[in-house]
Interface confidence: low
């Protein structure tokens, strides 16, 4: 089938001791090969500081996956989610302030 770019959604969840978990979700993309990773100050975080979900079918002929990492509260602006899919790439910031969701569809 033709290439379908992912919808990328970055969310935050508060956890204890001043840390938050930031999760980057990519959904509704085809084909299934995708790079999704967290960067701090533009530098990719190491594998053992991130957690990934499998790339799974979402029931519509497209795929979904996610990557998460824990960061210190207040340092959100230093982190971005990097996505590369079928030759296209983009970076997605962690939402600031009270906004805990950020959506962006790649074209």
């Amino acid at each position: 089938g033709s290439t379908v770019p992912p919808m990328v959604n970055v969310t935050c969840s508060e956890v204890s001791e001043g840390n938050i978990t930031v999760t980057c979700r990519a959904s509704s993309f085809y084909p299934r090969n995708i790079t999704l990773t967290w960067r701090q100050d533009g530098v990719s975080l190491s594998h053992n500081t991130q957690q990934w979900g499998d790339v799974l079918p979402d029931g519509n002929g497209t795929y979904q996956t996610w990557v998460a990492t824990r960061i210190r509260q207040g340092e959100e602006q230093r982190f971005t989610c990097y996505m590369e899919h079928s030759g296209n790439h983009g970076t997605h910031p962690v939402p600031s302030g009270n906004s805990h969701h950020h959506h962006h569809h790649h074209h």
């Epitope: 960067r39 530098v43 190491s46 594998h47």
Partner: antibody, heavy 120, light 107 residues
Framework: QVQLKESGPGLVAPSQSLSITCTVS????????VNWVRQPPGKGLEWLGM???????DYNSALKSRLSISKDNSKSQIFLKMNSLQTDDTARYYC??????????????WGAGTTVTVSS | DIQMTQTTSSLSASLGDRVTISCSAS??????LNWYQQKPDGTVKLLIY???SLHSGVPSRFSGSGSGTDYSLTISNLEPEDIATYYC?????????FGGGTKVEIK
């Protein structure tokens, strides 16, 4: 074009230390991890360790006490240092880029390797 | 460490033959298995990642399969340039470990 090239001393005396440099081009060390793998003559491949984009390192526990991996992002160079070499450290030493997404992790581009002989 | 075993250290086949190379792990590795080709001059190339995904630029005559502890690499139509040693490698747990290799020669 992604390329990696190892350069080493060729010959090292027993009990001395080994330093090898891997110079890369075509990609940034801040965004990719680089692995070190060696192959003794006539034998298989052995993973030594790696350095991630953020500078974190992982080592093969069997060699951890003798190994150190570092890098200079601005010069696109990775450095392997191994102490207390013995004759069974004689091998071809490779650097290889580590690519990963999701739960897939693989060494997608390898250098040609540099041969190190430990002998007096 | 997880031990990877390639029971056949060398094999001879005719051009055009279908060649299968097997690899077994000392414990389940959840398809976290790659295959590499090493030419006689020492050049190493990635062929297959995550059990069955063909790396870009690799001919389609190469394929991978398996699950649990048992995996295989198949060359469907052996060509002269396939003369090499083939290594499986697991990355289920650090350290990544390689099989002992299978050398493929022409009859």
């Amino acid at each position: 074009q992604v390329q990696l090239k190892e350069s080493g001393p060729g010959l090292v005396a027993p009990s001395q230390s080994l330093s090898i440099t891997c110079t890369v081009s075509g990609f940034s060390l801040t965004g990719s991890g680089v692995n070190w793998v060696r192959q003794p003559p006539g034998k298989g491949l052995e993973w030594l360790g790696m350095i991630w984009g953020d500078g974190n390192t992982d080592y093969n526990s069997a060699l951890k006490s003798r190994l150190s991996i570092s890098k200079d992002n601005s010069k696109s160079q990775i450095f392997l240092k191994m102490n207390s070499l013995q004759t069974d450290d004689t091998a071809r030493y490779y650097c290889a880029r580590g690519a990963y997404y999701g739960k897939r992790w693989y060494f997608d581009v390898w250098g040609a390797g540099t041969t190190v002989t430990v002998s007096s | 460490d997880i031990q990877m075993t390639q029971t056949t250290s060398s094999l001879s086949a005719s051009l055009g033959d279908r060649v299968t190379i097997s690899c077994s792990a000392s414990q389940g590795i959840s398809n976290y298995l790659n295959w590499y080709q090493q030419k006689p001059d020492g050049t190493v190339k990635l062929l297959i990642y995550y059990t069955s995904s063909l790396h870009s630029g690799v001919p389609s005559r190469f394929s991978g399969s398996g699950s649990g502890t048992d995996y295989s690499l198949t060359i469907s139509n052996l060509e002269p340039e396939d003369i090499a040693t083939y290594y499986c490698q697991q990355y289920s747990k650090l350290p990544p470990t390689f099989g002992g290799g299978t050398k493929v020669e022409i009859k």
